[in-house]
Structure formats: structure tokens, C-alpha cells
């Protein structure tokens, strides 16, 4: 039977992809989340839709990815922002856009920024506007660590599976 | 002999890199393609030049990467665009730049966007201009899936091996 | 004892992360470097601070990463630039920002660009300004290869562990 002897998430993977013959021994924790397009003024990560998945121990809790085993992980995220004409009223000052992946660990009592990207856009001067932000890197993480994101400019997000996402995989 | 018992692409790899002692059991499918700089108004991917390669089953067909075995892959791509203003009239209309990695699968009868980045540039206002776009993420892919790209703004591509590329590797 | 029988860098990893049970056989070369924030007009990579690390053979010499074993590596880097206009005259001349990962190999007598990103900013028109640049890809590297970076716009770097970094890991 597809998925027999696999972890629940791996079994789910095998069911979704019947051609995939996944040996549990070769599986590595991996996750890919997408921004929920039905939530316009917040960024809620979803794992149960489109191309998103949680595999081999990764779980999603309180909008954070929980690291299943200690090791080195590649962590990545992307956002796309957009805006229309005349959205700024009585200002020509720029709009601050930022996206950050943060680590909350038992080792530290606060959120540690792992990946940060920033942009100033001048929506009153250039309209419509679009901006993409991507980053990713390798980090030593510990079982139970929480990976989350913080975004400045959420009302301007272009929420689709291919534009706003967040993921990690063990190396 | 270098490359004995390896797949053709792995054997080619071993020949190119004589110091590499590649055990077939540890090889994983990987590919890195670069945009053909001799084709100015199209984006044709090349695997047989510069730092580009196809390894352990990946192949390039109809400008698409063919996924050799089912599993989770990290897929990535970058483009760099540049331009000069054509005329003062360019101030009124922005140039839409976009780059997308798409999946064509037996499971779906259409191209599914996996990775999308977008930008509006205002060539009449800021000349010359340059813009880079990068994205990458992990996806569950099935043997035979086709990975391709779609780009808006192809005439503005800065085609070099280090600026325009497309790749994937199995996790 | 934690780290017994491991390479020095792996032992250091195990000590830093006591919950990590690292079997040497599963370790793969990996490195993540951050830009030294105490050096404002240069980009010096550091491995002994914050989230940075060198594992399983990677070393840092002359501001370059030395590739420990031949194989395919994913190489990545990010920079964030920022600035304010100095004077209205700044409107006339754009600022060229670029970041490149380069390979110096025994096979070639010069630095080969692997990853390049570029941007023109117009600081007199839009102030303050912020711009992020990221890129990463898979490359076939040979033991002893040197990976380094070249940056145009160093005085404008936003030097923090989450904004300016450079890394690689074996696939």
C-alpha cells in the first residue's frame, strides 16, 4: 500500500504523488508553505493546499514552522508587494516594505532575525508598482525551534501560491 | 577509467572534473542552465556551456527541464533586466517585467506557476536602469514533470552565465 | 563526550547545539558567513559569530570560502543597501549597486563570475532608499576552489547578520 510504514506526512505525500516511491530512510524534513489568499490584511501560512506541504516531521503551529530534528536547514521565503495609482494621499514619502524570517528558540528569549529584506517604494511617484523580495540561507537549528515571518506592508501583498511562500529543508 | 559505471551525465561530470570521485549511490539529480547569450529576443536555456550542467537523469527538452525521478526538488531561477529610455513618452507607461517558473505535469492539463516575481520599471524616469529578480523553493515533483520558465521583458534581459539562470536539485 | 570522533568544525557544531546528535557520515560541507558590521567601508566575511558557521571542511581564508571536497554545491549570497541623498545634484547621476559571487579555481587563471545581481538607484529622486539583492545556484566545484564576493556600493551596505551574508552547502 502506498505510504505504509511512513510517517503520516510522508504517507500523505505518497498518496498525493502515487508515482513517488519514498524510502523512509532517505526522507528529510522539508516544508513549503504558501500565504493564505483569503486573508487580505494578515499573512497566514498554509500547508494543506496547492503545492504546499509538510514532510517528515515539520509541523505548522501558531503560524510558525516547528523544526523536527536538530541539524542544518536551508530556510527561504518570498513576498511580492503591489500597489495602485493614487493609493498615497497627502504624502510623497516612501512606503517601507520589509520581510523577515525569524527564529524563536529555547536558547534565546526573543525572536532572532535570520533573513531580512527591505525596500522603500515611492507609490505616489511611480504607479502602479510591483516589488518582489526573496531570501534564503543555511542555519544550524535545534529540535523545537520555531521559524516565523514578520512583514511590513502586509496590505500590499500579492497573495498567490507562486508569489508569497516560506519553506525550509534539512541538508 | 573516470566515469565507468556512471550515467552519461555523471560520467561527463567526472571527466570535466577529474578530481571528483563520484559514487553513483550518492549522486542526486541536479541541473543548472544558463540563458543563451546569442539569442537576444528569446530565452533559450543551455546546459552544455560555461558552468551549466545536467546530472543524474535531468534532461533538457523543448526548453524545459524534465524531472528524472519523483521526489522533492529545490527549483530556482534568476534574471537580470536592463534598459535605457526610448523617448520622453516612456514616462507615462511603465514596463512590466516578470519571471516565472512553471510546472507542466501529467496531473494537470495546464502550466502551473511555481515561482513568480514581478516588477514595474519606469524607463523614461530613470535611465539607465537595471533590475534583478531571483526566486527558489522546494516542490514535490513527479517523474516526467516538465519545468519551464516564462518571462515578460525578454528584450531587456542581460544574458550572461551569472545573471540569467535556471536550475533544480533533488533534496 | 560531545563531538568525539567528529571533525573540529563538526565537534564545534555539536558543542554549540548539545541536542544535535551528528553522525559524521551524514555531515556535509556547509558554510554561512555574515558581513562584519564593525567594518563600514569593506565587506569582510565572518564565520565565528551570530548564526555563522563553517562545517565539515569549509574554511575561510583571505575573505574567500575554500571548497573542501569536489562536488556540487549550492552557493548563495545576499546584500542590502541603503542611503539618503547627499544633495539635490544627486538626481543627475544614478548609483550603481552590484553584488557578485566569484570562483577562483586552479582550472582558470582569473575570477569567474558565478552569480551577479545589479541595480541602479537614483538617490536624489527617491530618498531615503533601500534595496535588497539575493542570488543562489548550484555549481560543480573542485576541492581547493575559492569562492569570494565582489560588491559595488560597499559604503551603502546595511551590515547585519540577517541582511548581508554568503554561504554554500554540498548537495
Amino acid at each position: 500500500l502506498p505510504g505504509v510504514g511512513l510517517t503520516p506526512s510522508a504517507a500523505q505525500t505518497a498518496r498525493q504523488h502515487p508515482k513517488m516511491h519514498l524510502a523512509h530512510s532517505t526522507l528529510k524534513p522539508a516544508a513549503h508553505l504558501i500565504g493564505d489568499p483569503s486573508k487580505q490584511n494578515s499573512l497566514l501560512w498554509r500547508a494543506n493546499t496547492d503545492r504546499a506541504f509538510l514532510q517528515d516531521g515539520f509541523s505548522l503551529s501558531n503560524n510558525s514552522l516547528l523544526v523536527p530534528t536538530s541539524g542544518i536547514y536551508f530556510v527561504y521565503s518570498q513576498v511580492v508587494f503591489s500597489g495602485k495609482a493614487y493609493s498615497p494621499k497627502a504624502t510623497s514619502s516612501p512606503l517601507y516594505l520589509a520581510h523577515e524570517v525569524q527564529l524563536f528558540s529555547s536558547q534565546y528569549p526573543f525572536h532572532v532575525p535570520l533573513l531580512s529584506s527591505q525596500k522603500m517604494v515611492y507609490p505616489g511617484l511611480q504607479e502602479p508598482w510591483l516589488h518582489s523580495m526573496y531570501h534564503g540561507a543555511a542555519f544550524q537549528l535545534t529540535q523545537g525551534d520555531q521559524l516565523s515571518t514578520h512583514t511590513d506592508g502586509i496590505p500590499h501583498l500579492v497573495l498567490s501560491p507562486s508569489t508569497v511562500f516560506f519553506g525550509a529543508f534539512a541538508l | 577509467l573516470p566515469g565507468v559505471g556512471l550515467t552519461p551525465s555523471a560520467a561527463q561530470t567526472a571527466r570535466q572534473h577529474p578530481k571528483m570521485h563520484l559514487a553513483h549511490s550518492t549522486l542526486k539529480p541536479a541541473a543548472h542552465l544558463i540563458g543563451d547569450p546569442s539569442k537576444q529576443n528569446s530565452l533559450l536555456w543551455r546546459a552544455n556551456t560555461d558552468r551549466a550542467f545536467l546530472q543524474d537523469g535531468f534532461s533538457l527538452s523543448n526548453n524545459s527541464l524534465l524531472v528524472p525521478t519523483s521526489g522533492i526538488y529545490f527549483v530556482y531561477s534568476q534574471v537580470v533586466f536592463s534598459g535605457k529610455a526610448y523617448s520622453p513618452k516612456a514616462t507615462s507607461s511603465p514596463l512590466y517585467l516578470a519571471h516565472e517558473v512553471q510546472l507542466f505535469s501529467s496531473q494537470y492539463p495546464f502550466h502551473v506557476p511555481l515561482l513568480s516575481s514581478q516588477k514595474m520599471v519606469y524607463p523614461g524616469l530613470q535611465e539607465p536602469w537595471l533590475h534583478s529578480m531571483y526566486h527558489g523553493a522546494a516542490f514535490q515533483l513527479t517523474q516526467g514533470d516538465q519545468l519551464s520558465t516564462h518571462t515578460d521583458g525578454i528584450p531587456h534581459l542581460v544574458l550572461s552565465p551569472s545573471t540569467v539562470f535556471f536550475g533544480a536539485f533533488a533534496l | 563526550l560531545p563531538g568525539v570522533g567528529l571533525t573540529p568544525s563538526a565537534a564545534q557544531t555539536a558543542r554549540q547545539h548539545p541536542k544535535m546528535h551528528l553522525a559524521h557520515s551524514t555531515l556535509k560541507p556547509a558554510a554561512h558567513l555574515i558581513g562584519d558590521p564593525s567594518k563600514q567601508n569593506s565587506l569582510l566575511w565572518r564565520a565565528n559569530t551570530d548564526r555563522a558557521f563553517l562545517q565539515d571542511g569549509f574554511s575561510l581564508s583571505n575573505n574567500s570560502l575554500l571548497v573542501p571536497t569536489s562536488g556540487i554545491y549550492f552557493v548563495y549570497s545576499q546584500v542590502v543597501f541603503s542611503g539618503k541623498a547627499y544633495s539635490p545634484k544627486a538626481t543627475s547621476s544614478p548609483l550603481y549597486l552590484a553584488h557578485e559571487v566569484q570562483l577562483f579555481s586552479s582550472q582558470y587563471p582569473f575570477h569567474v563570475p558565478l552569480l551577479s545581481s545589479q541595480k541602479m538607484v537614483y538617490p536624489g529622486l527617491q530618498e531615503p532608499w533601500l534595496h535588497s539583492m539575493y542570488h543562489g545556484a548550484a555549481f560543480q566545484l573542485t576541492q581547493g576552489d575559492q569562492l569570494s564576493t565582489h560588491t559595488d556600493g560597499i559604503p551603502h551596505l546595511v551590515l547585519s547578520p540577517s541582511t548581508v551574508f554568503f554561504g554554500a552547502f554540498a548537495l
Epitope: P88, K89, L125, Q126, P155 | T91, S92 | -
Partner: antibody, heavy 114, light 113 residues
Framework: EVQLVESGGGLVQPGGSLRLSCAAS????????IEWVRQAPGKGLEWVGE????????NYNEEFKGRATFSADNSKNTAYLQMNSLRAEDTAVYYC???????WGQGTLVTVSS | DIQMTQSPSSLSASVGDRVTITCKSS????????????LAWYQQKPGKAPKLLIY???TRDSGVPSRFSGSGSGTDFTLTISSLQPEDFATYYC?????????FGQGTKVEIK
């Protein structure tokens, strides 16, 4: 409902300091600049400066540079104006505003007098 | 700094009158980037905060009655109230947001005749 609410005004001695708060609610705060504008009794509007809460970037009216300091706490959706070396002519209603959306607070009166 | 000069400084009018207030800037407020003028008009009533009426010189803010309109470009701008209503008696300010520091006109007080 979107609101900007100033607080912290009151009577201050000449040479003294005060910190005004501007609490935002009903919209995401960090991406949009908060401007500070003041109005002396019976006079017109005077722009003090602005802060981008997310980035920490600031722009000051040169007339206030050195005496005014802007800051923000994104976790509290609140911007602050610290004014030092206060003089009688600093007596005014101080407003915070978000020009991007066109929101203004109700203002807080600062009186500098001995 | 850009100087903003409003005229008149005060005016008396009756309900139903057409009222025009002008605002001159010491340099152009036209952004070449978007061909828009960085000028706003505010209405302020005694003891209240200013209320945004017009931005980018001619765009009415949401909820602002259609009798208010803004026009002009470069250095010369006009706020027009086509038919003055009792609730329109207030002080009106123009403001430039083309460059720093942002500056306001000295105000025009519209009083009941």
C-alpha cells in the same frame, strides 16, 4: 475604525522636556510614515517632521533638529515625539498624522510656562 | 524651503456662494515622474484637527462632497467650493509635499457674511 490618538501633552516648565505619544489603531502601522504637525494658538500649521516606524528613517524640519526626536514602537503601534529645551513659543497643539491614508489625530495641547 | 502663499487670508461669503481660494508655491510642485502636483488642501474647524479634502492637487478624498474641487499645476493652485454650505465655514490650508520640509500656507478663513 482607524484612529490616531495623541497623548502626553500638558504644562511644562521652560527648558523642560516632554514625550508625546501617537497610538495608531485600525490599520497596519509600520509601513506608513507618521508626521508631526503643530499649531500655536490662533496660528497656522507647522510641520515638525516624520518617522517611518518600520525602518526608523526620519525627516526633520531643520528648525526642530536637535530639539525634537522621533521614535516608534511597532509592537505597540505607537510613535513618539520627544521635545527638549522647551520655550514659551513651543506652546501649541501637537498633531500626529498619516499622510498616506489622510488620517489625523485629535491633537494634544502642550503649554510651556513657568 | 518652499514658501506657500494663500490668498485671501480671509473672506466673507454667503451660503450658496461660489468660493475660490488660491495657493502659490515658490517653486513647482509638479513631479516629472508621474505628472502630478504634490499639493493637498485641508479644512480645519475651531478646536478640531485638520481634515484632508484634496490631494495630488485635484483628487477629492473619500467622503468629501463634490462641491469641493482642486485645480492648478506647477506653482499656482486653486480650491473651489461651488456652492458654500453652512458646514463649510472654516479655515482652509494648502500644503506642499514635494520636498522637505513640508510647508503649509498661512490659511484662509472663510466666514459668514
Amino acid at each position: 475604525e482607524v484612529q490616531l490618538v495623541e497623548s502626553g501633552g500638558g504644562l511644562v516648565q521652560p527648558g523642560g522636556s516632554l514625550r508625546l505619544s501617537c497610538a495608531a489603531s485600525g490599520y497596519t502601522f509600520s509601513s506608513y510614515w507618521i508626521e508631526w504637525v503643530r499649531q500655536a494658538p490662533g496660528k497656522g500649521l507647522e510641520w515638525v517632521g516624520e518617522i517611518s516606524p518600520g525602518s526608523g528613517s526620519t525627516n526633520y524640519n531643520e528648525e526642530f533638529k536637535g530639539r525634537a526626536t522621533f521614535s516608534a514602537d511597532n509592537s505597540k503601534n505607537t510613535a513618539y515625539l520627544q521635545m527638549n529645551s522647551l520655550r514659551a513659543e513651543d506652546t501649541a497643539v501637537y498633531y500626529c498624522a498619516d499622510g498616506y491614508h489622510g488620517y489625523w489625530g485629535q491633537g494634544t495641547l502642550v503649554t510651556v510656562s513657568s | 524651503d518652499i514658501q506657500m502663499t494663500q490668498s485671501p487670508s480671509s473672506l466673507s461669503a454667503s451660503v450658496g456662494d461660489r468660493v475660490t481660494i488660491t495657493c502659490k508655491s515658490s517653486q513647482s510642485l509638479l513631479y516629472s515622474t508621474n505628472q502630478k502636483n504634490a499639493l493637498a488642501w485641508y479644512q480645519q474647524k475651531p478646536g478640531k484637527a485638520p481634515k484632508l479634502l484634496i490631494y495630488w492637487a485635484s483628487t477629492r478624498d473619500s467622503g468629501v462632497p463634490s462641491r469641493f474641487s482642486g485645480s492648478g499645476s506647477g506653482t499656482d493652485f486653486t480650491l473651489t467650493i461651488s456652492s458654500l454650505q453652512p458646514e463649510d465655514f472654516a479655515t482652509y490650508y494648502c500644503q506642499q509635499y514635494y520636498s522637505y520640509p513640508r510647508t503649509f500656507g498661512q490659511g484662509t478663513k472663510v466666514e459668514i457674511k
